[in-house]
């Protein structure tokens, strides 16, 4: 048979951050190539990454069409020199991925503190509204556009001279916090989607401290 040395893909894994979504699998091909198909539960299969020797396929363009849908992918294995060959059952070997719902499962990317401004004993901290690859009307949507009030940010802030981290939360991209006059503070933010059960938190933003470039101080 032409598929004697063809092996099915395995360990199919979705890797997704802020909706940039790649399907990965094993093994590295030896004398075989792969084609990926993706569909929604009720939709038709669409082929991607035709006859590739890679073990990953960028499916972002497909999943951003509707991030709230649940997707299934499958990876077909073909002999390298004879992609028309089929397995013993009359079709190529393939393996299904786990189901993937981008809105519920994409990892939240590391946020960035855009700026902070102190006015007296108040500090306004602004989080950058990161752009995603989700489009509406030919415009790329921000993370806030996609998730709305489902997305909150947790701010950790502390005096430069101490270790205890106070917290504040917002469902916008801005915090207004009280600080002690004459004290320097450091800040870090974390994106959170509380309604999720998995992938609820992002990694923390880089720490920004008062007295450094991003801040402004006004009496």
């Amino acid at each position: 048979s032409g598929t004697t040395n063809t092996v099915a893909a395995y360990n199919l894994t979705w890797k997704s951050t802020n909706f940039k979504t790649i399907l990965e699998w094993e093994p590295k091909p030896v004398n075989q190539v792969y084609t990926v198909q993706i569909s929604t539960k009720s939709g038709d299969w669409k082929s991607k990454c035709f006859y590739t020797t890679d073990t990953e396929c960028d499916l972002t363009d497909e999943i951003v069409k509707d991030v709230k849908q649940t997707y299934l992918a499958r990876v077909f294995s073909y002999p390298a020199g004879n992609v028309e060959s089929t397995g013993s059952a009359g079709e190529p070997l393939y393996e299904n991925s786990p189901e993937f719902t981008p809105y519920l499962e994409t990892n939240l990317g590391q946020p960035t503190i855009q700026s902070f401004e102190q006015v007296g004993t108040k500090v306004n901290v602004t989080v950058e509204d990161e752009r995603t690859l989700v489009r509406r009307n030919n415009t790329f949507l921000s993370l806030r556009d996609v998730f709305g009030k489902d997305l909150i940010y947790t701010l950790y802030y502390w005096k430069s001279s101490s270790s205890g981290k106070k917290t504040a939360k917002t469902n916008t991209n801005e915090f207004l916090i009280d600080v002690d006059k004459g004290e320097n503070y450091c800040f870090s933010v974390q994106a959170v989607i509380p309604s999720r059960t998995v992938n609820r938190k992002s990694t923390d933003s880089p720490v920004e401290c008062m007295g450094q470039e991003k801040g402004e101080f006004r009496e």
């Epitope: 909150i152 947790t154 950790y156 270790s163 205890g164 981290k165 106070k166 917290t167 504040a168 939360k169 917002t170 469902n171 009280d178 974390q190 959170v192 509380p194 309604s195 059960t197 998995v198 992938n199 609820r200 938190k201 923390d204």
Partner: antibody, heavy 120, light 107 residues
Framework: EVQLVESGGGLVQPGGSLRLSCAAS????????IHWVRQAPGKGLEWVGY????????YYADSVKGRFTISADTSKNTAYLQMNSLRAEDTAVYYC?????????????WGQGTLVTVSS | DIQMTQSPSSLSASVGDRVTITCRAS??????VAWYQQKPGKAPKLLIY???FLYSGVPSRFSGSRSGTDFTLTISSLQPEDFATYYC?????????FGQGTKVEIK
Amino acid sequence: EVQLVESGGGLVQPGGSLRLSCAASGFTISQYWIHWVRQAPGKGLEWVGYIDPYNGYTYYADSVKGRFTISADTSKNTAYLQMNSLRAEDTAVYYCARDYGSLRVSLDYWGQGTLVTVSS
Amino acid sequence: DIQMTQSPSSLSASVGDRVTITCRASQDVNTAVAWYQQKPGKAPKLLIYSASFLYSGVPSRFSGSRSGTDFTLTISSLQPEDFATYYCQQHYTTPPTFGQGTKVEIK
């Protein structure tokens, strides 16, 4: 089912140490925040401190700062409260609680509590 | 730190009575206030979150409201299982703080 189970309480002399455990099941602690709250006999609830197990960040009530340390082992899905230099006024039932972490909901699940008695 | 001043500290009531407990925050806490019920020897249980939202599984006779920095827990018709101690808590800022508690006893 979400569950928190505290253990490690007991009788300890003033100046002594004790480590309480809070074993979580039904959820992953690194995706939430864990707080410790205590209640002295016949008294109200007093917040002790919190940890974000994801990054290790903590904050403590002034009454325990420098004496108590909260930590977490995400591989065991367990949070800890290390109590040093214990005083009679630390005698209380100690509860761990899960912080849902939203703007609207804070401590949604609590453990059953473990009694710590500081006495000579 | 934000103080949560709860009143009364105790009250006596009969089954079927309407009961009101109040909590005043020392500064703005938005709606970040929860109410808990605690029975002797048991852990507190969440009743109301975000000042006025009933937590899952809590009977509808419990309700919460907010007016500025004043927060109210109301039990519309007290039941035998409602005799307990009730606490308010703000989680608007760190550290979170609790009210002193209100013990609801049988008249």
